[in-house]
């Protein structure tokens, strides 16, 4: 579409503007420019016929216009009256018309403004200040900046006189700022130098710091007074109404209870003539007592008992605080505080609730901490674990079993073999074992405080012959390029070497194969379809060796990009079309066909008898594997020609 772009849109007087033509059609007869929004012969600026290269000035031609071969119009030495719309009328070679309208605006250049003020030292909450931006300029926009920010919205700020005057009513100290005015029109912007408004204010009610009013006997009292004021305030101190000194700070070392009383700071502003005072009451205390914790249950049982911890002593108007493990109390439904925070109750204690616990008393001066208290939570025994984990031993070796169960107090242990009590020790040792030492080994753990007992049974086999191993797997149907598989050779046997074979060969070197757990575990990372082989593990010691039955890994993969056969793409009319689709996949994929995007049958083979040119198009085979969740497809273009029209065409099936 033919368009006109004015460069620039806003033009300074005396400068030039280019009415730039975009998308000028090819093959032109000529073009003509007009002042205004339409084609009007009385307002024609200039016409140009390409064939004759003839430019004809019109009634609106001023001598400042230059027309270019690309139809763009340059207007020089711009005057105010040039503002407005301009229309380009284009006639194409076939005498078809097109027109487009553009516009620009003309503005004068602006001088640098300045600010005049009617009050150089206004008093807060009393005076008003009027700033005026000079000079007054026609067709200019006036803007104001406070600390280089645009004007805030405020009922005390009023713009008038076409925004040329900024009035601040009832000035405040916050109006002490850098003020600038700016004059703008679309072709220039000028900003004044800044004017700083100096507002006299205060003094405000002084603040005495620090804020705390309670002190311990023997400390130093160091009070500082400050009142917001311009110019800065002069300060005086009074204690119980008696003048002390004319300074901003008051210092009394090594105070006693006798220094308790009212402390007054007076601030004075000599320019505004105002005085303000603030009084603080100081109390000097003797040392408070150190807190301690009492408990209603010194040996609570896990998951059964509750414990109430109380912070002593009880003091009126005191804040009690608690810490667990040197942290503030966590949020937990098992932790409850009394209304006065003095008692902390732990509901249904666990072994993790041992602490330490601390309480604190907060007074006006500080926080005093108790000594830490640790809870003795009785728990267990948990299910015992027997180590080592071997279940097969050779005759003649020593059998050394150890039992452990988490318990407080520590558990008492008993060993039983085939149900017969052996000894009351944590460890069981039998030297030079024989096949007769095979059997069920039971460890029993007992907690005398809770009265609870737990047992674990382990089957020990003593045999010169190693058993036939078996392979366990953590994933029976891994997906290609996604899953890992870990094979473990069972059982775990002492002094035994574990070996692995793949398809009857020793393990190949591969970064995807990793042995661990003393070679007992073989992990295949990122399985591929080539990993679908027979895996065998073997165990051996110095007297025997044995191999597992093979385990074949069933790797799910595909579907790969299908192949459509036969490969022919051109057929003669009347032939039979018999397309077969195949994709490598495990399990076998589901097949479906689409012709020109329209679904057909869900078969591996697509058969169409006696095809015609109507059967031209795209034949797509889609394959999906429900097990891997993956899909694939291929598209084949088939061209059917009328019989005998083109050589080299397939006759079909």
């Amino acid at each position: 579409k033919l368009t006109i772009e004015s460069t620039p849109f806003n033009v300074a007087e005396g400068k030039e503007v280019l009415l730039l033509v975009h998308n000028l059609p090819q093959h032109l007869f000529g073009y003509s420019w007009y002042k205004g929004e339409r084609v009007d012969g009385n307002r024609q600026i200039i016409g140009y016929v390409i064939g004759t290269q003839q430019a004809t000035p019109g009634p609106a031609y001023s001598g400042r216009e230059i027309i270019y071969p690309n139809a763009s119009l340059l207007i020089q030495n711009i005057i105010q009256n040039d503002t407005g719309f301009y229309t380009l009328h284009v006639i194409k070679s076939d005498l078809v018309n097109e027109e487009a309208t553009g516009q620009f605006r003309v503005y004068p250049e602006l001088p640098k403004p300045s600010i005049s003020s009617n009050n150089s030292k206004p008093v807060e909450d009393k005076d008003a200040v009027a700033f005026t931006c000079e000079p007054e300029t026609q067709d200019a926009t006036y803007l104001w900046w406070v600390n280089n920010q645009s004007l805030p919205v405020s009922p005390r700020l009023q713009l008038s006189n076409g925004n040329r005057t900024l009035t601040l009513f009832n000035v405040t100290r916050n109006d002490t700022a850098s003020y600038k005015c700016e004059t703008q029109n679309p072709v220039s912007a000028r900003r004044s130098d800044s004017v700083i408004l100096n507002v006299l204010y205060g003094p405000d009610a002084p603040t005495i710091s620090p804020l705390n009013t309670s002190y311990r006997s023997g400390e130093n009292l160091n009070l500082s007074c400050h009142a917001a004021s311009n110019p800065p305030a002069q300060y005086s101190w009074f204690v119980n109404g008696t003048f002390q000194q004319s300074t901003q700070e008051l210092f009394i070392p090594n105070i006693t209870v006798n220094n308790s009383g009212s402390y007054t700071c007076q601030a004075h502003n000599s320019d505004t003539g105002l005085n303000r005072t603030t009084v603080t009451t100081i109390t000097v205390y003797a040392e408070p007592p150190k807190p301690f914790i009492t408990s209603n249950n010194s040996n609570p049982v896990e998951d059964e008992d509750a414990v109430a911890l109380t912070c002593e002593p009880e003091i009126q108007n005191t804040t009690y605080l608690w810490w667990v493990n040197n942290q503030s109390l966590p949020v937990s439904p098992r932790l409850q505080l009394s209304n006065d925070n003095r008692t902390l109750t732990l509901l249904s204690v666990t072994r993790n609730d041992v602490g330490p616990y601390e309480c604190g008393i907060q007074n006006e001066l500080s926080v005093d901490h108790s000594d830490p208290v640790i809870l003795n939570v009785l728990y267990g025994p948990d299910d015992p674990t027997i180590s080592p984990s071997y279940t097969y031993y050779r005759p003649g070796v020593n059998l050394s079993l150890s039992c452990h169960a988490a318990s407080n107090p520590p558990a008492q242990y008993s060993w039983l073999i085939d149900g017969n009590i052996q000894q009351h020790t944590q460890e069981l040792f039998i030297s030079n074992i024989t096949e007769k030492n095979s059997g069920l080994y039971t460890c029993q753990a007992n907690n005398s405080a809770s009265g609870h007992s737990r047992t674990t049974v382990k089957t020990i086999t003593v045999s010169a012959e190693l058993p036939k191993p078996s392979i366990s797997s953590n994933n029976s149907k891994p997906v290609e390029d996604k899953d890992a598989v870990a094979f473990t050779c069972e059982p775990e046997a002492q002094n035994t070497t574990y070996l692995w074979w793949v398809n009857g060969q020793s393990l190949p070197v591969s970064p995807r194969l990793q042995l661990s757990n003393g070679n007992r575990t073989l992990t295949l990372f990122n399985v591929t379809r080539n990993d679908a082989r027979a895996y065998v593990c073997g165990i051996q010691n110095s007297v025997s060796a044995n191999r597992s039955d093979p385990v074949t890994l069933d790797v799910l993969y595909g579907p790969d990009t299908p192949i459509i056969s036969p490969p022919d793409s051109s057929y003669l009319s009347g032939a039979n079309l018999n397309l077969s689709c195949h994709s490598a996949s495990n399990p076998s994929p589901q097949y479906s066909w689409r012709i020109n995007g329209i679904p057909q049958q869900h078969t591996q083979v697509l058969f169409i008898a006696k095809i015609t040119p109507n059967n031209n198009g795209t034949y797509a085979c889609f394959v999906s594997n429900l097990a891997t969740g993956r899909n694939n497809s291929i598209v084949k273009s088939i061209t059917v020609s009328a019989s005998g029209t083109s050589p080299g065409l397939s006759a079909g099936a």
């Epitope: 000529g30 084609v39 009007d40 009385n42 016929v49 064939g51 006639i91 076939d94 005498l95």
Partner: antibody
Framework: EVQLLESGGGLVQPGGSLRLSCAAS????????MGWVRQAPGKGLEWVSS????????SYADSVKGRFTISRDNSKNTLYLQMNSLRAEDTAVYYC??????????????WGQGTLVTVSS | DIQMTQSPSSLSASVGDRVTITCRAS??????LNWYQQKPGKAPKLLIY???SLQSGVPSRFSGSGSGTDFTLTISSLQPEDFATYYC????????FGQGTKLEIK
């Protein structure tokens, strides 16, 4: 003085052909766009065709497109209209007309006196 | 194609009358409108081009106005030689004419 003189009109049977000529003088013919306009007996004006100064650009009314061909010979200052497959509804006075050197927008400022074409069996 | 409709199709007036003929386009044609005068047995004569521009040599009593779809030809004071048929023509594509307005002596 601009002058345009048409010739070649006459009686022709339906399906027949006719070639109209327009001799131009009094202006620079080679740089002017030219056109044909017709007027059926007792009817209004109908624009027929136009041609650019160098013969490169031609336009036709839908009613004659494919049957009529406009052409020019700048060396002879002559405009032509070849009319084939004539029909009874092509019966009209055919005017040759000039587009001015600076035609913004396109308009016909000089016309010939016309030549009558009658299509009848 | 753009259709041009003139109204009225015929008009009776007296010498000295002010006469207005209107032309309406079926879609906007900007200011691309021309007016022609044709007397019986004669070739058409250009009066107004670009809706309002008076062709050189045409009396100033003829004037044109309008843009977009509605246009007007005005004869401010009818003279005896002005009785003729008037055609509007759009200069878009193709350059179709209106059906004409016949101005007769009352």
């Amino acid at each position: 003085e601009v002058q345009l003189l048409e010739s070649g009109g006459g009686l022709v049977q339906p399906g027949g052909s006719l070639r109209l000529s327009c001799a131009a003088s009094g202006f620079t013919f080679s740089s002017s766009y030219m056109g044909w306009v017709r007027q059926a007996p007792g009817k209004g004006l109908e624009w027929v065709s136009s041609i650019g100064s160098g013969s490169y650009s031609t336009s036709y009314a839908d009613s004659v497109k494919g049957r009529f061909t406009i052409s020019r010979d700048n060396s002879k200052n002559t405009l032509y209209l070849q009319m084939n497959s004539l029909r009874a509804e092509d019966t009209a006075v055919y005017y040759c007309a000039r587009y001015p050197p600076v035609p913004f927008p396109p308009h016909l400022d000089y016309w010939g006196q016309g030549t009558l074409v009658t299509v009848s069996s | 194609d753009i259709q041009m409709t003139q109204s009225p199709s015929s008009l009776s007036a007296s010498v000295g009358d002010r006469v207005t003929i209107t032309c309406r386009a079926s879609q906007s044609i900007s200011s691309y409108l021309n007016w022609y005068q044709q007397k019986p047995g004669k070739a058409p004569k250009l009066l107004i081009y670009a809706a309002s521009s008076l062709q050189s040599g045409v009396p100033s009593r003829f004037s044109g106005s309008g843009s977009g779809t509605d246009f007007t030809l005005t004869i401010s004071s009818l003279q005896p030689e002005d009785f003729a048929t008037y055609y509007c023509q759009q200069a878009g594509n193709p350059h179709t004419f209106g059906q004409g307005t016949k101005l007769e002596i009352k």
